[in-house]
């Protein structure tokens, strides 16, 4: 079951660069975190598209914490239609891209998807089925998505994570929103579609936030986040509607939608890894 | 029966390296149906998982956050033992270190089902 | 990282009691969870794994329930020997985490 005259090179994570310009965590709501302490602290509101003041606690808490509201708005807000383009191009991989493959120690033989930093290209790995890192995508496809370079050598992708039910891995998910167009609608409409933890097979709808449209998934009974639709039409009317779309020369057209105050269940949160 | 002995050093100076090594027997450190790990305990910090490797055709291994700029866990297949290294320690890694051997892999319930018996390292000057 | 967190901290009982103690995850883990003993100077010991499941050896008045964020160890019938402290790990995530122990006291 060994092979002893293995050579003991060690696959490990390599030095990550940080990313830069809009970030899938500019999302999250505000968390003040468990401690007590009194900090003035910035986070990005997704209802009112401004960086805003918050107090947070001192310790946990989420990434859309910023010390400065200079900073906030450099990690999250948009200029106008151009910088959006500019943004959107110049965009770099996430994190997890640079991550090493990891099968993580379990022994199931799930065929995933890597980048590979050397290479420059996603590639097939056998996943455990347990632990692992977030480099780590069921299509060949989504990781070509998230983490190899377009064909002007930009990347084009936001991101977001989630934990996958099936296997308990942590797992990226894109949560792109198509060029053409600014979400303000419920922040979860941005969230990955995720199935939760339970054995079930329901039949639910989520909002697809690269492609702009509700699609279909199984959802197992339990846990899962606020992206999660009995029907189609509920799916659209309380997602679709939150997008403004973008004409190409830079005017905007907005959609009619009603501004209705929801709240975020702690659910939605947890999706998202908190320290990558 | 699995064994996990382990062997280092009680006291380390202040941004010197931590150095255990834990002896295998009764399994492979290369076996691919198991990982191996370390683990500290303080007071202060309570049970915090470091790292793990494990070979699956090859070396893999996996760091916590917290120490994965300092520290490095080496296999060495020909004493059937691994090593745990932490570099520039300071007072505050100071705890009771023990290695530990992931069990359950096949089954994907896993969990730590042997352990060796905790080496106290002192960090102080 | 997915935080555990036990109650209570310590509680005192007497031989022959029913002990239970809790486990909270900051996150839904499923079943991911196992229970360990630690005895003074000694390393943790497995005592459940997978939330419910017995490891060999381990004596079953030993049980574990729960499923999500919420999970229990009970002791049906408390023993000299049990007197120690208990702890609850989650591996639905990467890294595995530690509760901070629950402490058996004799009353």
């Known amino acids: 079951d060994s092979e002893e005259d293995e050579e003991h090179t060690i696959i490990t994570d390599t030095e990550l660069p940080p990313l830069k310009l809009m970030h899938s965590f500019c999302a999250f709501k505000a968390d003040d975190g468990p401690c007590k302490a009194i900090m003035k602290r910035f986070f990005f509101n997704i209802f009112t598209r401004q960086c805003e003041e918050f107090i947070y606690g001192g310790c946990e808490g989420n990434q859309n914490r910023f010390e400065s509201l200079e900073e906030c708005k450099k990690m999250c807000t948009r200029d106008n239609a151009n910088r959006i383009i500019k943004t959107t191009l110049q965009q770099e991989k996430p994190d997890f891209c640079f991550l090493e493959e990891d099968p993580g120690i379990c022994r199931g033989y799930i065929t995933r998807y890597f980048y590979n930093n050397q290479t420059k290209q996603c590639e097939r790995f056998k996943y455990g089925g347990c632990l692992g890192n977030m480099n780590n995508f069921e299509t060949l496809e989504e990781c070509k998505n998230i983490c190899e370079d377009g064909p002007n050598g930009f990347q084009v992708d936001n991101y977001g994570t989630q934990l996958n039910a099936v296997n308990n891995s942590l797992t990226p998910q894109s949560t792109k929103v198509p060029s053409l167009f600014e979400f303000h609608g419920p922040s979860w409409c941005l969230t990955p579609a995720d199935r939760g933890l339970c054995r079930a097979n329901e039949n639910r709808f989520y909002y697809n936030s690269v492609i702009g449209k509700c699609r279909p998934f199984k959802y197992s009974g339990c846990g899962g986040n606020e992206n999660n639709f009995t029907s189609k039409q509920e799916c659209l009317r309380a997602c679709k509607k939150g997008f403004i779309q973008r004409i190409s020369k830079g005017g905007l057209i907005k959609t009619k939608r009603k501004r209705k105050k929801q709240r975020v269940k702690i659910a939605y949160e947890e999706i998202f890894v908190k320290n990558m | 029966q699995v064994q996990l002995q382990q062997s280092g050093p009680g006291l380390v100076k202040p941004s010197q390296t931590l150095s255990l090594t834990c002896a295998i027997s009764?399994?492979?450190?290369?076996?691919?149906?198991?990982?191996w790990g370390w683990i500290r305990q303080s007071p202060g910090r309570g049970l915090e998982w470091l790292g793990h490797i494990y070979y699956r055709s090859k070396w893999y291994n996996s760091y916590a956050v917290s120490v994965k700029s300092r520290i490095t866990i080496n296999p060495d297949t020909s004493k059937n033992q691994f090593s745990l290294q932490l570099n520039s320690v300071t007072p505050e890694d100071t705890a009771v270190y023990y290695c530990?051997?992931?069990?359950?892999?096949?089954?994907?319930?896993?969990?730590?089902?042997?352990w060796g018996q905790g080496t106290l390292v002192t960090v102080s000057s | 990282d997915i935080q555990m967190t036990q109650s209570p901290s310590s509680l005192s009982a007497s031989v022959g009691d029913r002990v239970t103690i809790t486990c909270r995850a900051s996150q839904n883990i499923s079943n991911y969870l196992n229970w360990y003993q630690q005895k003074p100077g000694k390393a943790p010991k497995l005592l459940i794994y997978g939330t419910s499941s017995l490891q060999s050896g381990v004596p079953s008045r030993f049980s574990g329930s729960g499923s999500g964020t919420d999970f229990t160890l009970t002791i049906s019938s408390l023993q000299p020997e049990d007197f120690a402290v208990y702890y609850c790990?989650?591996?639905?995530?990467?890294?595995?985490?530690f509760g901070q122990g629950t402490k058996v006291e004799i009353k």
């Open positions: 790990q989650q591996y639905g995530n990467n890294p595995t985490t």
């Open positions: 009764g399994d492979s450190v290369s076996s691919n149906g198991a990982a």
């Open positions: 530990a051997r992931w069990g359950g892999i096949h089954d994907g319930d896993i969990y730590f089902d042997y």
